[in-house]
Interface confidence: low
């Protein structure tokens, strides 16, 4: 449901899928549930700092402490995961730094980084002491429920001993777990008594049971895996951009829009225009003209460049960014001065591209 009318004579090529949109990912801070997390806002000369999470203002509460340039989250839960931003407001400008918080039980790679050579798990028994299987490290088995974001790697461990050395097999939902049951299969590291699944998907959800047995007995332990699909959010635009600008008649000017979006964003540059001497259509909505959008023929849609401007180019320029979740827009004003008047920038913006898409 668009909230504007497009000028009828605006010539736009048919909507094309946006070009591959390059962004540098914000820094990611990882914490396990229950841990405390402290993040320092990496902005210099910050007089006043405000914080947001997923684009919504973040205030202090019984678990969130905001002290100076520090954000502390006590007893983190998966609901604390998301895109955070701190904005430093100064007298002349403002600057925003984005970072991700990921509160998850999942290990971050397919390697057994918490294992050494596995010697502490692989117990050698004296051949005379026959013994049924037993767990050698129950601490590594305490957490039965694993909620893991999609695409992460999961490792389940059942360190055991016995004589003769027990064998280990894995069941999924009570049935034999075969390699062909999942795309990419899985790894079993017998020396580490572990099952590893890389790049989990929702169909990996279920109960995983290790069965450890020898001729004297059998023991088993069940883990529950829940695969959480990532919830994208609507685009977030860097505060203060695009910035107001002024130039003389015949001069050139650039507006810049910095976007963070974890779903494919579509950028439009829009300007209010007049039609038949009116700024508004019969429905009361303003006439808008799309000057540029991130279609296949657009280069660097984040930047709108205007060359050889005239007085008619003065006015409000809107950067509108949408993805399939929602949209965001911010605007700036262009002032066009007579040639004899020297232009002065209304805002001094020092925006680093390092932390934004």
């Amino acid at each position: 449901r668009p909230s504007f009318s497009l000028v009828e004579d605006t010539t736009l090529e048919p909507e094309e899928p946006p070009t591959k949109y390059q962004i540098s990912q914000p820094e990611v801070y990882v914490a396990a549930p229950g841990e405390s997390l402290e993040v320092r806002c990496l902005l210099k000369d910050a007089a006043v700092i405000s914080w947001t999470k997923d684009g919504v203002h973040l205030g202090p509460n019984n678990r969130t402490v905001l002290i100076g340039e520090y954000l502390q989250i006590k007893g983190a839960t998966p609901r604390d995961s998301g895109l955070y931003a701190c904005t430093a407001s100064r007298t002349v400008d403002s600057e925003t730094w984005y970072f991700m918080v990921n509160v998850t039980d999942a290990i971050s790679s397919g390697d057994d980084e918490d294992d050494t050579d596995g010697a502490e798990d692989f117990v050698s028994e004296n051949s005379n002491n026959k013994r049924a299987p037993y767990w050698t490290n129950t601490e590594k088995m305490e957490k039965r429920l694993h909620a893991v974001p999609a695409a992460n790697t999961v490792k389940f461990r059942c360190p055991a001993g016995g004589n003769p050395m027990p064998t280990m097999r894995w069941l999924k939902n009570g049935k034999e777990f075969k390699q062909e049951h999942r795309i990419g299969g899985y790894k079993v590291r017998n020396q580490h008594w572990s099952l590893i699944m890389e790049s989990v998907v929702p169909s990996d959800k279920g109960n995983y049971t290790c069965v450890v047995e020898n001729e004297y007995g059998s023991i088993n332990h069940t883990y529950h895996l829940d695969v959480v699909e990532r919830s994208p959010h609507r685009p977030i635009l860097q505060a203060g951009l695009p910035a107001n600008a002024s130039t003389v008649v015949g001069g050139d000017v650039e507006f810049v829009c910095k976007v963070y979006s974890d779903a494919q964003p579509h950028i439009q540059w829009i300007k209010h225009v007049e039609k038949n001497g009116s700024k508004y259509g019969p429905d009361g909505l303003p006439y808008l003209k799309v000057l540029k959008h991130s279609g296949i023929n657009s280069s660097n849609a984040e930047v709108l460049a205007l060359f050889n401007v005239t007085e008619a180019d003065a006015g409000e320029y809107i950067c509108k960014v949408s993805n399939y979740i929602g949209q965001a827009n911010q605007s700036a004003w262009l002032t066009v001065l007579p040639k004899q008047q020297a232009p002065g920038r209304e805002k001094e913006i020092t925006a680093s591209p390092d932390y934004l898409e």
Partner: antibody, heavy 122, light 107 residues
């Protein structure tokens, strides 16, 4: 224009089955979770079931768990609700709505179908 | 499960009045709360998302606010077209729960 059109409702006897459909148009169906909501005559709204983009994960209200199955066919942009062992308390208008578990999305439940009426009676 | 207690169950007000409807959550749900309007014989319509954000096309006389576990929908300058039943919905986790509804009538 975003449109959701439900069908498949009707009069059915207790213990029997019924399958509802919801055809979506005007948006990228496989980019959204989808949800069924129902409303008994003269009563309030009740969440019934939700399904993820791919259909791999499904979620159900306790009152329908084990009797009702939500599914989707992304190629046909269609959402389904298979209702088995129907009871009189399942009598309601069933609405489908597009969903986004992301929380603050303005598109979350912003589009609803016109509803399809299910009456369970002998 | 988290309970949503909506009040009042019905409300009668004059045109031009300011009315407020409240939902109380039994546990913390953050800002994961929405408000819907349903007119007789019609499908529900999203009015407020994220506890405080106005949905597309909703008149600015509608607003949402939060104070702790209490969430409010306020209508300023009541108009005849606002006569409807209003529901809150919490959606921080499954199962999603609607409030019982508030029937708003015009005196």
């Amino acid at each position: 224009e975003v449109q959701l059109v439900e069908s498949g409702g009707g009069l059915v006897q207790p213990g029997r089955s019924l399958k509802l459909s919801c055809v979506a148009s005007g948006f990228r169906f496989n980019d959204f979770w989808m949800t069924w909501i129902r409303q008994a005559p003269g009563k309030g709204l009740e969440w019934v079931a939700s399904i993820t983009y791919t259909g791999d994960n499904t979620y159900y209200a306790g009152s329908v768990k084990g009797r009702i199955t939500i599914s989707r066919d992304n190629a046909k942009s269609t959402l389904y609700l298979q209702m088995n062992s129907l009871r009189s308390e399942d009598t309601a208008t069933y609405y489908c709505t597009r969903d986004d578990y992301g929380g603050y999305s303005p598109y979350y439940m912003d589009a609803w179908g016109q509803g399809t009426s299910v009456t369970v009676s002998s | 499960d988290i309970q949503m207690t909506q009040s009042p169950s019905s409300l009668s007000a004059f045109l031009g009045d300011r009315v407020t409807i409240t939902c109380r959550a039994s546990q913390d749900i953050g800002n994961y709360l929405r408000w819907f309007q349903q007119k007789p014989g019609k499908s529900p319509r999203l009015m407020i998302y994220g506890a405080t954000n106005l949905a597309n096309g909703v008149p600015s006389r509608f607003s949402g606010s939060r104070s702790g576990s209490d969430y409010s929908l306020t209508i300023n300058n009541l108009e005849s077209e606002d006569m409807a039943i209003y529901y809150c919905l919490k959606h921080n986790e499954y199962p999603f729960t609607f409030g019982s509804g508030t029937k708003l009538e015009i005196k």
